[in-house]
Interface confidence: low
Amino acid sequence: GITIPRNPGCPNSEDKNFPRTVMVNLNIHNRNTNTNPKRSSDYYNRSTSPWNLHRNEDPERYPSVIWEAKCRHLGCINADGNVDYHMNSVPIQQEILVLRREPPHCPNSFRLEKILVSVGCTCVTPIVHHVA
Amino acid sequence: GITIPRNPGCPNSEDKNFPRTVMVNLNIHNRNTNTNPKRSSDYYNRSTSPWNLHRNEDPERYPSVIWEAKCRHLGCINADGNVDYHMNSVPIQQEILVLRREPPHCPNSFRLEKILVSVGCTCVTPIVHHVA
């Protein structure tokens, strides 16, 4: 691959733990300023596979609050507004990075952690297993 | 709120940038070992609001590869397998944390960044604006 020349203004990396331990600036840069203004806030209610959102809080994690989606039904909502059990509501999951305080209660020392969160739900055709 | 006592084994925080700059251990701890083994990988094809996945790569970001969902249709797939334009396929978006090398090309210095990613799609009833 291409070797990118190292920036001469980089912090010193002679730490014995390098490259496992790095410096991270927590002043978050938000690249989402130009996102589509169409409101996605009510999809959880308008979806044919609606979901509820539950607060997951952990003061030892950054960010400390994450909202988890739980599908309301096993089936999906049909045109009549009833639950159709020939279809399935399933959670769409994503692995996300969070920072975990390590050692615990330390204000300036973290470990990178991967957690799986449910972001919302979608309606899928079930997999039918035919018995011979 | 509750004040959690500081761990005496914490790294020194007398840095002039504290608490903006923290130490992060990049040895990722994966908490997803007990997740449901039922693979969600085929939901993108089986959904009534199917989507394609596009690779977004950036060597200055950690993780460097992120997969973005793009809904295949404006409408949703009905029971006959046709696109029903009385319903809408919409992306479910989530803000995620990534690490951005800062200054650029530095191996051990990062800034926390928030980006908006589309994780999958769901089928929603459209908002109809009635004209008087």
Epitope: R39, S64, V65, V119, G120 | Q93, Q94
Partner: nanobody
Framework: EVQLVESGGGLVQPGGSLRLSCAAS????????MYWVRQAPGKGLEWVAS????????YYVDSVKGRFTISRDNAKKSLFLQMNSLRAEDTAVYYC????????????WGQGTLVTVSS
């Protein structure tokens, strides 16, 4: 650092009124759509109302239309929710939220203020 601090909750009898406030800091308040959302005991999150950046448009969930009024004071970086004709089913922790309420990943939530409607 973004901070949202809700206040004004409490115990009220059915049919009564409360006015919730949210004090915002750490961001340009006037640039963002703002929301009130609530979570009833043991239930999921429910969007209640939202208001555009300049206060020109308001949106409400059907169950509160005609009873709740959302407003904002950009000069004071404050968001309000006037709740009238309160019902037992309005009992919940009320949160104010900044910008889109989805994605719901970041700490742009206060601790909330508990509203209990009971006789």
């Amino acid at each position: 650092e973004v901070q949202l601090v809700e206040s004004g909750g409490g115990l009220v009898q059915p049919g009564g009124s409360l006015r919730l406030s949210c004090a915002a800091s750490g961001f340009t308040f006037s640039s963002y759509r703002m929301y009130w959302v609530r979570q009833a005991p043991g239930k999921g999150l429910e969007w209640v109302a939202s208001i555009e950046q300049d206060g020109s448009e308001e949106y409400y969930v059907d169950s509160v239309k005609g009873r709740f009024t959302i407003s904002r004071d950009n000069a004071k970086k404050s968001l309000f929710l006037q709740m009238n004709s309160l019902r037992a089913e309005d009992t919940a922790v009320y949160y104010c939220a900044k910008g889109e309420i989805l994605p719901l990943y970041f700490d742009y939530w206060g601790q909330g203020t508990l509203v209990t409607v009971s006789s």
